[in-house]
């Protein structure tokens, strides 16, 4: 297993609709054709794998398990979007990238993106 640098933004604020997007960029030492991206959430004394996708370079990412994630890839960048977030989902979201094929296997883990989620205030009742 060889180490690889992964960069991601330090902080992202989710939209009022509970959507957060960030870029996960990895310094690929070679020409990988198969890449696996996993997003992990670290909070509340748990580490949770939020979503994972394996993709062939040039193809779109496919996530399993009713995923709350969507994503696209462009070169060594993965644009990740996490949906359906609530205030309780605030936490550190870590991007993990694995270059699966061809060998050698490379692994890179980012420092994490702190995603802040603020639940929208309910609209006051209107007489109009």
């Amino acid at each position: 297993c060889k180490a690889m640098h992964v960069a991601q933004p330090a902080v992202v604020l989710a939209s009022s609709r509970g959507i957060a997007s960030f870029v996960c960029e990895y310094a690929s030492p070679g020409k990988a054709t198969e890449v696996r991206v996993t997003v992990l959430r670290q909070a509340d004394s748990q580490v949770t794998e939020v979503c994972a996708a394996t993709y062939m370079m040039g193809n779109e990412l496919t996530f399993l398990d009713d995923s709350i994630c969507t994503g696209t890839s462009s070169g060594n960048q993965v644009n990740l979007t996490i949906q359906g977030l609530r205030a309780m989902d605030t936490g550190l979201y870590i991007c993990k990238v694995e270059l699966m094929y061809p060998p050698p296997y490379y692994l890179g883990i980012g420092n994490g993106t702190q995603i802040y989620v603020i639940d929208p205030e309910p609209c006051p009742d209107s007489d109009f």
């Epitope: 949770t48 794998e49 979503c51 399993l64 398990d65 009713d66 995923s67 709350i68 309780m88 989902d89």
Partner: nanobody, 126 residues
Framework: EVQLVESEGGLVQPGGSLRLSCSAS????????MGWFRQAPGKEREFVAS????????SSADSVKGRFTISRDNAKNTVYLQMNSLKPEDTALYYC???????????????????WGQGTQVTVSS
Amino acid sequence: EVQLVESEGGLVQPGGSLRLSCSASGRTFANNAMGWFRQAPGKEREFVASISASGTLTSSADSVKGRFTISRDNAKNTVYLQMNSLKPEDTALYYCARNRRAWSLSVHTTREYDDWGQGTQVTVSS
């Protein structure tokens, strides 16, 4: 309704290992995340680990990270909890539970789970 039946626990020495299994019958097992929780005497039920419907995603409590591994076999309708390097503080009643979804960010909360096993006692003592 889903029936969840845990394997027998037991008495294990500190540093020892034990594998729990949980068999499910009823609704389609492969559609739902599964989890393990535990409850020590006089304490609240706490999250241990969970695994997504397809088995690709997992979540675990910091207290068991690196020691406990959750896995599942959808062909056998069974979820497993491999417990290594057991400590006296792991002593508890262990419950298997079925999540109402394939996966979510709230898999560590008890309210996400609809069906529960009866529990199996694990005691770690010399």
